[in-house]
């Protein structure tokens, strides 16, 4: 694994090929999670930020930007969207959490919580995922669509199997995240596929 502290994945072009596979040995279904990362893009169209598919299950967990100021979370192919007033283009720190028991999903944008939404109460997110940055999967690890590809930079990505309390979300935003047990930017197992470059993080 690699410590990517102070670095980002740069996706320099629109494509149907360029992506990063994130590798985790996640063995049991997710009842809760929190995902945090930083992103910087000047795309005004829709694009995938984080695509998690399992065998035979598309959009098992997907973080998707619909347009400026609109972020969507898919859980088990169901979707909620939260709105925020944001500058464009501008760097953003995104956290999203979901709790199976209540179905509550919550986005935090730059340390500020958006309106909570609910979906898939009682559902468990399947384990053994293929996780892709830079493209939106329509199959298990593939079937990409250029029009949903990400162009820009992504870094500081952490994923926990719990709903983090607000103070820990703020810690992640401020650059001092808790150790993460699904994906940890400081100890990341990944595979670069295509034209993706690792560069210093210069926009925080």
């Amino acid at each position: 694994h690699t410590d990517l502290s102070g670095k980002v994945f740069v996706f320099p072009r629109e494509s149907v090929t360029d992506h990063v596979n994130l590798i985790t040995p996640l063995e049991k279904p997710l009842q809760n999670f929190t995902l945090c990362f930083r992103a910087y893009s000047d795309l005004s169209r829709a694009y995938s930020l984080f695509s998690y598919n399992t065998q035979g299950r598309d959009n098992e967990l997907l973080v998707y930007k619909e347009r400026v100021g609109e972020y969507s979370l898919y859980i088990g192919r169901h979707k909620v969207t939260s709105k925020v007033i944001e500058k464009f283009p501008a760097p953003v720190h995104i956290c999203v959490s979901w709790e199976s028991s209540s179905g509550i999903a919550e986005f935090w944008i730059n340390g500020t919580p958006l309106v909570k939404k609910g979906l898939r109460q009682g559902y468990f997110v399947e384990a053994q995922p293929k996780i892709v940055l830079g493209q939106e999967q329509d199959s298990y690890g593939g079937k990409f669509d250029r029009s949903q590809s990400f162009v820009g930079e992504i870094g500081d990505l952490y994923m926990w199997d719990s709903v983090l309390p607000p103070e820990n979300i703020l810690s992640a935003y401020q650059g001092t995240p808790l150790p993460a047990n699904i994906l940890d930017w400081q100890a990341l197992n990944y595979e670069i596929r295509g034209y993706v470059i690792i560069k210093p993080l210069v926009w925080v």
């Epitope: 410590d3 985790t24 047990n181 100890a187």
Partner: antibody, heavy 119, light 107 residues
Framework: QVQLVQSGAEVKKPGSSVKVSCKAS????????MHWVRQAPGQGLEWIGM????????NYNEKFKSRATITADKSTSTAYMELSSLRSEDTAVYYC????????????WGQGTLVTVSS | DIQMTQSPSSLSASVGDRVTITCKAS??????VAWYQQKPGKAPKLLIY???YRYSGVPSRFSGSGSGTDFTLTISSLQPEDFATYYC?????????FGQGTKLEIK
């Protein structure tokens, strides 16, 4: 096989410093966080801090932040932990331990280095 | 810092016995707990990670359970080589912290 071999026992005077080494073999040294943990005689385990040898990023237990310095030499696959301003309470066995592949647990440990602080 | 409190601190048992050691965290640590075994003069060895997963090569008589604040290590049928000190550890928050240990002795 994966192995961590530490330097030998040390006897130090109060106020002095000690530098313990940990040589890694059998795996890619630059790909794993290395942690340091200590154990006072008859006591439990206490986490000191950690280093990623490739990025040289470190993280310390606040308790040791002002006195401990963790470094790594990629060319020799060796991690070091230096503790300064030693006092008698620092008498302990110091262990290096490798972080597991995917989780923040320690799957490989050095044999330990006894540091005795005595006047 | 998160305190990890183990109980009992020592325990006498016989070969073949079922033994349970508990660890209580001072705050929620989710499932981010490991158990280690340590024998005198030796380094600790990882037994259980993520509260309930046996580490590679660890005998099936060792099992772990729990989440949140309460965790358990169970040895289903004690073997002579199991007499040692056992430690729990949380890695949910920095600094990582350990329990004070449970010494398992032969009755």
């Amino acid at each position: 096989q994966v192995q961590l071999v530490q330097s030998g026992a040390e006897v130090k005077k109060p106020g002095s410093s000690v530098k313990v080494s940990c040589k890694a073999s059998g795996y890619t040294f630059t790909s794993y966080w290395m942690h340091w943990v200590r154990q006072a005689p008859g006591q439990g385990l206490e986490w000191i801090g950690m280093i990623h040898p490739n990025s040289v990023n470190t993280n310390y237990n606040e308790k040791f932040k002002s006195r401990a310095t963790i470094t790594a030499d990629k060319s020799t696959s060796t991690a070091y932990m230096e503790l300064s301003s030693l006092r008698s309470e620092d008498t302990a066995v110091y262990y290096c331990a490798r972080r597991n592949d995917y989780y923040w647990y320690f799957d490989v440990w050095g044999q330990g280095t006894l540091v005795t602080v005595s006047s | 810092d998160i305190q990890m409190t183990q109980s009992p601190s020592s325990l006498s048992a016989s070969v073949g016995d079922r033994v349970t050691i508990t660890c209580k965290a001072s705050q929620n640590v989710n499932s981010n707990v490991a158990w280690y075994q340590q024998k005198p003069g030796k380094a600790p060895k990882l037994l259980i990670y993520s509260a309930s997963y046996r580490y590679s090569g660890v005998p099936s008589r060792f099992s772990g359970s729990g989440s949140g604040t309460d965790f358990t290590l169970t040895i289903s049928s004690l073997q002579p080589e199991d007499f040692a000190t056992y430690y729990c550890q949380q890695c949910n928050n920095y600094p990582f912290t350990f329990g004070q240990g449970t010494k398992l002795e032969i009755k």
